[in-house]
């Protein structure tokens, strides 16, 4: 049962498995979420306690009823883990703590002229965790206006005093705001020689990266397969460090793979969940329970519905024992791991679901595309939206995108006219516009968010947002898009689709059925000589083939151009403008959604 | 032992420019503050301004303001100090003196440890 | 900027007498003061900081207190290597500034 509401002046007893230190209630909550086995809390404020050393305690707890006593204890506020809850959850904290110092290894200190220049530092910085700002009131003279970086081996205050005249808070990196380089590749037959902070089990180099990547010390990882020469090593993933960030030593070694935390690339890659069944092996670990079942999907469902299950290993029916019915051991362990990695067992192991949900929605996996044809079918675009005016008359006015729960990113040029939000209607999940009837449900425009630097689509800034009036509940047929993470900078991307209703050539009429086109990203210096007449700024981004016959048209406008990187789709482009369509020589221009993340995120979490 | 070792004497020809140097050893150079003061001869002290070795950003007196420039080189562990358009009245003994650890937010204590001085002298 | 005066210019004790430095800022610099001696041909040498916590390593006999405007620093038994010259600091805010210093010599 999911229970998001805290206890206050309760305290609850027992089942203690760790004790951290957190600023607020609400993030011991969270810490406790992401810890393998917490399923409730205590923390201890400061009214709690006369001893200072107690304030800010969150102390995380199990219990196998998933419950445990009340007791009643003034300042004291518990709780229950999200694991327990089916909705999106986030590790991303932005709050700032005034007049209080978050304790840990004091790394680095330099000036900075706010707190919010401090945050970023702090996000821009591969060691840190969180930060402490003194600010232009502290006493100490020599100290004022002074960031400090700092980081612990767990990513979590060593401690927290109060200190006036000082701020605190979090690195954004969990927030997917950090400029670092996002370093996807995993490297074959390589061991990376830098210090272990910590090795666990993991049945492939995928889950081992995953690991490393929400392990608050981890920057990059070797990991021994299964055809490791070391039998005691095998399926060993060593989590590492080093002082530059990066690995001071590469040696070549067959059997192994090594690779990079993922850290600053969180919310457009999946970094909690482990969806992938793993043939042949058995995974160790304590037993919760042993359930008869019909297959391993039956096992993964069982392992995700139940709290406290981590992970599982299925032994399929012998021929036609039991109804066809296999044993479904569902399994956990301190660290959320196997203790051990046995193969050739004949067994079925996989991880428990339930983690699937601290990853962005936009990362789940949609249904395969079909290649060739030109109209899409139902579900291949799930975050495609059509965004209708009803003045003067209901029409088909621009494509969108949803990218968030409450939230539709689109073409700003799309409201030239639009006086009011009234006239708008949004309909998601909508493969042909013939579905569209009086009583078809839509999502109502709250407000429309045209960035302030928006003139006209050709000269940029043509990025809008729409603020519906109802959250979205996310299906298979309506889920967002990742946006591009700002460590993807540098990523080239070959898999590139343009969708919408709109014409089929320049003389034409919105088409019944979303339409969809592969089409080549164009480098921007060659799209700057197709467009000799206008500024093809770095805000923008090309695309199109250099004989035409593809392209975005009228009506596409403000709809997404998807790419597919690393088996996630990501917006990289908002349809604009271009010179007549599908031209020859003459690309598709569309706004480079890279570009605005910063705006998008500055307006969808102040709204 | 905490020291702060200075480079030697200089004379200079008024309008000129002089770059003093302090080299510190035996703690962590990038935690700590620099500061430089000067005395003039048989005068009081007078802070000029103060580097932080780590970001390398500076504050200088009013005073100073356009005429002094602080640098260091954290490879070498050596704070800079260079005052140009020399005068006569800037003839003086200049000190590094270390100030705040800044890798802790608690108060100043104070310039705990100085230079040997180095004697700066404008003359035509 | 805080102007720091210190009086007297000139105090003459005898060893083993007690002496009484002032200090005064022209506007409240809290506790953030510093006294400092300061031998001939020598670099200044940090006694009190915090306006009354002592240096490490400096003897018991050397004392600050005050705050807001209004310092002192006393030397409760004058030895003979305590002649010298004493400044006050204050480092409430920028620029630092210094006092004009007060001499302690043999009565």
């Known amino acids: 049962e999911c229970v998001t509401r805290l206890f206050k002046d309760i305290h609850f007893e027992g089942g203690d498995i760790a004790t951290v230190f957190t600023p607020s209630a609400k993030h011991c909550q969270v810490v406790c979420t992401h810890h393998p086995r917490c399923l409730l809390f205590t923390f201890t404020g400061e009214s709690a306690s006369e001893d200072p050393t107690q304030w800010f305690t969150c102390v995380l707890k199990d219990s196998v009823t998933e419950t445990l006593p009340r007791v009643n204890r003034t300042g004291a506020i518990s709780g229950y883990s999200f694991k327990q809850c089916s909705h999106q959850i986030s590790a991303c904290n932005k709050d700032i703590y005034v007049d209080l110092d978050m304790k840990g290894i004091n790394y680095n200190s330099s000036l900075a002229k706010s707190a919010q220049e401090c945050q970023e530092r702090c996000t821009d910085d591969i060691h840190c965790h969180f930060f402490t700002y003194a600010t232009r009131q502290f006493p100490s003279l020599e100290h004022r206006n002074i960031c400090l970086l700092k980081h612990t081996q767990t990513g979590t205050p060593t401690g927290i005093m109060k200190l006036d005249k000082v701020v605190t808070g979090f690195s954004l990196k969990s927030c997917a705001l950090s400029n670092l380089a996002c370093i996807r590749d995993v490297f074959p037959n390589t061991v990376f020689a830098d210090s272990n902070i910590d090795s666990v089990m993991a049945p492939d180099a995928f889950v081992c990266r995953r690991i490393c990547t929400h392990h608050p010390g981890c920057l990059f990882f070797t990991f021994f397969s299964q055809e490791w020469p070391k039998e005691s090593q095998r399926n060993l993933c060593l989590l590492k460090t080093s002082e530059s960030g990066l690995p001071s030593t590469r040696i070549k070694k067959s059997k192994a793979l090594s690779g990079f935390s993922l850290q600053s690339c969180r919310h457009s890659i999946p970094v909690f969940c482990h969806s992938s069944f793993y043939h042949d092996t058995d995974f160790l670990g304590e037993e919760l329970d042993i359930v008869a079942v019909k297959g391993h999907e039956a096992c993964q469902k069982l392992c995700t519905n139940a709290v406290r299950c981590q992970f599982f290993t299925y032994a399929p029916a012998q021929a036609s024992c039991n109804e066809g019915k296999g044993k479904c051991y569902l399994k956990l362990s301190s660290n959320g791991s196997p203790t051990k990695i046995l193969r050739g067992t004949g067994g079925i192991s996989g991880y428990t679901l339930r983690l699937c949900k601290m990853d962005n929605e936009c990362t789940t996996k949609i249904k395969p595309r079909i290649v060739g044809g030109t109209a899409s079918v139902r579900g291949e675009w799930p975050w495609q939206v059509t965004l209708h005016t009803t003045s003067p008359t209901q029409r088909h006015l621009c494509g969108g995108s949803i990218i968030g729960n409450q939230w539709i990113l689109t073409a700003a040029h799309c409201f030239y006219g639009v006086e009011s939000p009234k006239i708008l209607r949004v309909y998601i999940g909508i493969l042909n516009q013939s579905e569209i009837k009086e009583d078809t449900s839509f999502f109502g425009v709250q407000e429309i968010i045209i960035h302030d630097q928006y003139k006209m689509a050709e000269s940029g800034y043509d990025i809008a947002l729409l603020k519906l009036e109802t959250t979205v509940n996310y299906t298979d047929s309506q889920r967002p898009i990742c946006l591009p993470s700002k460590g993807d900078r540098n990523v080239i991307y070959t898999d590139c689709w343009v969708t919408g209703w709109g014409y089929r050539k320049l003389r034409d009429k919105i088409q019944n059925t979303l339409q969809k086109a592969k089409i080549p990203l164009v480098t921007n210096d060659e799209c700057q000589k197709r467009y000799r007449g206008h500024k093809i700024t770095h805000k923008m981004i090309c695309a199109g083939y250099r004989e035409g016959g593809k392209d975005a048209c009228k009506g596409d406008s403000g709809g997404p151009l998807s790419c597919k990187h690393n088996e996630v789709w990501h917006l990289v482009g908002i349809t604009s403008w271009g010179e007549g369509c599908a031209q020859r020589e003459r690309p598709g221009v569309y706004t480079n959604v890279l570009e605005y993340v910063d705006w998008i995120l500055e307006k969808t979490q102040a709204a | 032992e905490v020291q702060l070792v200075q480079s030697g004497a200089e004379v200079k020809k008024p309008g000129a420019s002089v770059k003093v140097s302090c080299k510190a050893s035996?703690?962590?150079?990038?935690?700590?503050?620099m500061h430089w003061v000067r005395q003039a001869p048989g005068q009081g002290l007078e802070w000029m301004g103060i580097i932080n070795p780590s970001g390398g950003s500076t504050s200088y007196a009013q005073k100073f303001q356009g005429r002094v420039t602080m640098t260091r080189d954290t490879s070498t562990s050596t704070v800079y100090m260079e005052l140009s358009s020399l005068r006569s009245e800037d003839t003086a003994v200049y000190y590094c003196?270390?100030?705040?650890?800044?890798?802790?937010?608690?108060?100043?204590?104070?310039?705990?440890?100085w230079g040997q001085g180095t004697t700066v002298t404008v003359s035509s | 900027e805080i102007v720091m005066t210190q009086s007297p210019a000139t105090l003459s004790v005898s060893p083993g007498e007690r002496a009484t430095l002032s200090c005064r800022a022209s506007?409240?610099?809290?506790?953030?003061l510093a006294w400092y001696q300061q031998k001939p041909g020598q670099a200044p040498r940090l006694l009190i900081y915090?306006?009354?916590t002592r240096a490490t390593g400096i003897p018991a006999r050397f004392s600050g207190s005050g705050s807001g405007t209004e310092f002192t620093l006393t030397i409760s038994s004058l030895q003979s290597e305590d002649f010298a010259v004493y400044y006050c600091?204050?480092?409430?805010?920028?620029?630092?500034?210094f006092g004009g210093g007060t001499k302690v010599e043999i009565k």
């Open positions: 600091q204050q480092f409430n805010d920028w620029p630092l500034t």
């Open positions: 035996g703690y962590t150079f990038t935690s700590y503050s």
């Open positions: 003196a270390r100030g705040a650890y800044l890798l802790e937010l608690y108060y100043y204590y104070g310039m705990d440890v």
């Open positions: 915090g306006a009354s």
């Open positions: 506007q409240s610099v809290s506790s953030n």
